[in-house]
């Protein structure tokens, strides 16, 4: 009788748009059919998926974050069959272009400025801010109490993913008007 199979991988943490991953269904057995499923479904037709080695090896080329799914292999012969436990692929990606919220760019003097930066990334990225090119704290949220027109300028959020070796950033212009002189928003 066939044993419960297992899945081995040549790359446990592939990087999006860069790496390939080869899953192999163990053990190797003669006169055995090897089958694969992704998230409980049969393999989709895709030029990035390739079966080889008598269907025992499943290769994903140029992995994307959408490939971070549960992979299962099965083995079957004329007298028995069995399926592996699922193996979930951990795809490293990002950081994507960050988003600064709220989207407001005009503020009244005396308001609190509370900017949050978010970037899709696995693992979570490191965040840092620069105001008019000057480095600020390494936090996801930038808070400045009671802003004045002196706080006018460009606010840049920088994100870095050490696992993928990639960086990204976005710049936002902030205008602070003296109280009562602008219809700008008050935070």
């Amino acid at each position: 009788e066939l044993p419960k199979p297992s899945i081995s991988s040549n790359n446990s943490k592939p990087v999006e748009d860069k790496d390939a991953v080869a899953f192999t269904c163990e053990p190797e057995a003669q006169n055995t059919t090897y089958l694969w499923w992704v998230n409980g479904q049969s393999l989709p037709v895709s030029p990035r998926l390739q079966l080889s080695n008598g269907n025992r090896t499943l290769t994903l080329f140029n992995v994307t974050r959408n490939d971070a799914r549960a992979y299962v292999c099965g083995i079957q012969n004329s007298v028995s069959a069995n399926r592996s436990d699922p193996v979930t692929l951990d795809v490293l990606y990002g950081p994507d272009t960050p988003i600064i919220s709220p989207p407001d760019s005009s503020y009244l003097s005396g308001a609190n400025l509370n900017l949050s930066c978010h970037s899709a990334s696995n693992p979570s990225p490191q965040y840092s801010w620069r105001i008019n090119g000057i480095p600020q704290q390494h936090t996801q949220v930038l808070f400045i109490a009671k802003i004045t027109p002196n706080n006018n300028g460009t606010y840049a959020c920088f994100v870095s993913n050490l696992a993928t070796g990639r960086n990204n950033s976005i710049v936002k212009s902030i205008t602070v008007s003296a109280s009562g002189t602008s219809p700008g928003l008050s935070a």
């Epitope: 089958l35 049969s42 028995s80 069959a81 399926r83």
Partner: nanobody, 120 residues
Framework: EVQLVESGGGLVQPGGSLRLSCAAS????????MGWFRQAPGKEREFVAS????????YATDSVKTRFTISRDSAKTTVYLQMNSLRPEDTAVYYC?????????????WGQGTQVTVSS
């Protein structure tokens, strides 16, 4: 030894209903697909329906899908085939089977079969 034990077959009039059951002797079947094949006199054995390990179902034809319903118990070791609106052409020996992707690959595990006869 692995065993699949079927029950529920019999003689029924056209338009009637039957419920087939198939119990597996081992818990490893929770990781396998279970389903039903049938063989009419003088014909080859054909796939009817299956319940996959992941909770999906597959049916041979739309005609079967509209009249038959396959289901599985929570332990995934017993499979049922509820057959409604039976027709004379449904007369066959119905076999329970277990394996991987039953509709595409010949399964390794088979029951002994249960006779279903639709006749007035």
């Amino acid at each position: 030894e692995v065993q699949l034990v079927e029950s529920g077959g019999g003689l029924v009039q056209p338009g009637g209903s039957l419920r087939l059951s198939c119990a597996a002797s081992r818990g490893t079947f929770s990781r396998l697909d279970m389903g039903w094949f049938r063989q009419a006199p003088g014909k080859e054995r054909e796939f009817v329906a299956s319940s996959t390990w992941s909770g999906g179902t597959a049916y041979a034809t739309d005609s079967v899908k509209t009249r038959f319903t396959i289901s599985r118990d929570s332990a995934k070791t017993t499979v049922y085939l509820q057959m409604n609106s039976l027709r004379p052409e449904d007369t066959a020996v119905y076999y329970c089977a277990a394996g991987l992707s039953l509709e595409q690959h010949t399964p390794p595990y088979w029951g002994q079969g249960t006779q279903v006869t639709v006749s007035s």
